[in-house]
């Protein structure tokens, strides 16, 4: 759609753009799945325009319908499936909270490969933070062409 | 200037314990994750265990698993290796070794070793 | 678990000359995830090269890695006095990560 040229004095941001693209950060202690992220110029290709970090984990601040995209690469990997190490290594994605609306959004199965990706399209809610586990004891990468997760706001 | 200083090696009889420490220093030790790699008198290099910058995630060889145990006190900047149940194949020089930012092992910084023999 | 086979165990040359060390590999390394050390008697081992062919942090250019797949080579162009050593290949795309027994290059 054309925007008036009102609309285009504004910053992304008010128009309801809001996007974020993360690097891998660090793995959680002991007893902690979760994936910590880091975004910001600074850090090379990673931004956060609109959503938030929250201690490593994204949280949204604007109603709508989100692409939410992932990708990870170990970087301690077993290609036999067979491993104790390797057997069962799943990503998740979800609202982790609020309580009230956690829910899984996307789950993989990393099988006889290193590499995970998978993008969908969600109806996000302001406040909401995703979670990112990785079970299994294998380690991401941290290479920022090899571990990125995402999230871009489509419409209302 | 990265440095890597490990201590507590010795002679132990078989099926003692030790605990081999590496202290680091010259880099933010918690963003990195660590190795224990040894080398047996005359041999090859072998890796043994292996752990993430937060400590959650570790790993170890099959010779090892069940007996070794890594660990690390990010607050003290130091590496630790519980080995139990030592073997005369144990006996070898321990290296820590630092692994790249990118979490993939291999090692851009080693200490210079601590010598372990397991003999009766 | 990947086995690394070097060849040969032992090359005399004279400095000046040209050294290519080889490391086979029982099966695939994910990615070129391989790395070459040097190490001198009494001495921890010194990373040479990552990524098969990338230069680590402070080593000369004389020192070059290449390959893929099973088959890898540690090429210096010219050698120096200090770069008679044992030279190693790791692979690090597959749990465990596995050395090879070295390769010993002795002045000639």
């Known amino acids: 759609q054309r925007l008036s040229r009102a609309q285009q004095q504004l910053p992304l941001e008010s128009l309801g753009w809001d996007i974020a693209e993360l690097q891998l950060n660090h793995t959680g202690p002991q007893q902690d799945p979760r994936l910590y992220w880091q975004g910001g110029p600074a850090l090379g290709r990673s931004f956060l325009r609109g959503p938030e970090l929250d201690k490593g984990q994204l949280r949204i601040r604007r109603d709508g319908i989100y692409m939410v995209h992932i990708q990870v690469t170990l970087a301690i990997c077993s290609s036999t499936s067979t491993s104790r190490h390797h057997h069962p290594t799943t990503l998740a994605v979800g609202i982790c909270s609020p309580a009230s609306r956690s829910i899984s959004l996307l789950r993989l199965s990393f099988h006889q490969g290193c590499t995970i990706a998978s993008q969908r399209l969600t109806p996000l809610a302001r406040g909401d933070t995703l979670c990112t586990n990785l079970t299994g004891t294998l380690l991401p990468s941290r290479n920022t062409d090899e571990t990125f997760f995402g999230v871009q706001w489509v419409r209302p | 200037e990265v440095q890597l200083l490990e201590s507590g090696g010795g002679m132990v009889q078989p099926g003692g314990s030790l605990r081999l420490s590496c202290a680091a220093s010259g880099f933010t030790f918690s963003t990195y994750a660590m190795s224990w790699v040894r080398q047996a008198p005359g041999k090859c290099l072998e890796w043994v265990s292996a752990i993430s910058g937060s400590g959650g995630r570790t790993f170890y060889a099959e010779s090892v698993e069940g007996r070794f145990t890594i660990s690390r006190d990010n607050s003290k900047n130091t590496l630790y290796l519980q080995m139990n149940s030592l073997r005369a194949e144990d006996t070898a020089v321990y290296y820590c070794?630092?692994?790249?930012?990118?979490?993939?092992?291999?090692?851009?910084?080693w200490g210079q070793g601590t010598l372990v023999t397991v003999s009766s | 678990e990947i086995v690394l086979t070097q060849s040969p165990g032992t090359l005399s040359l004279s400095p000046g000359e040209r050294a290519t060390l080889s490391c086979r590999a029982s099966q695939s390394v994910r990615s070129t995830y391989l790395a070459w050390y040097q190490q001198k008697p009494g001495q921890a081992p010194r990373l040479l090269i990552y990524g098969a062919s990338s230069r680590a942090t402070g080593i000369p250019d004389r020192f070059s890695g290449s390959g893929s797949g099973t088959d890898f080579t540690l090429t210096i162009s010219r050698l120096e006095p200090e770069d008679f050593a044992v030279y190693s290949c790791q692979q690090y795309g597959d749990l465990p990560f596995t050395f090879g027994c070295g390769t010993k290059l002795e002045i000639k």
């Open positions: 070794a630092k692994h790249d930012y990118s979490n993939y092992p291999y090692f851009d910084y």
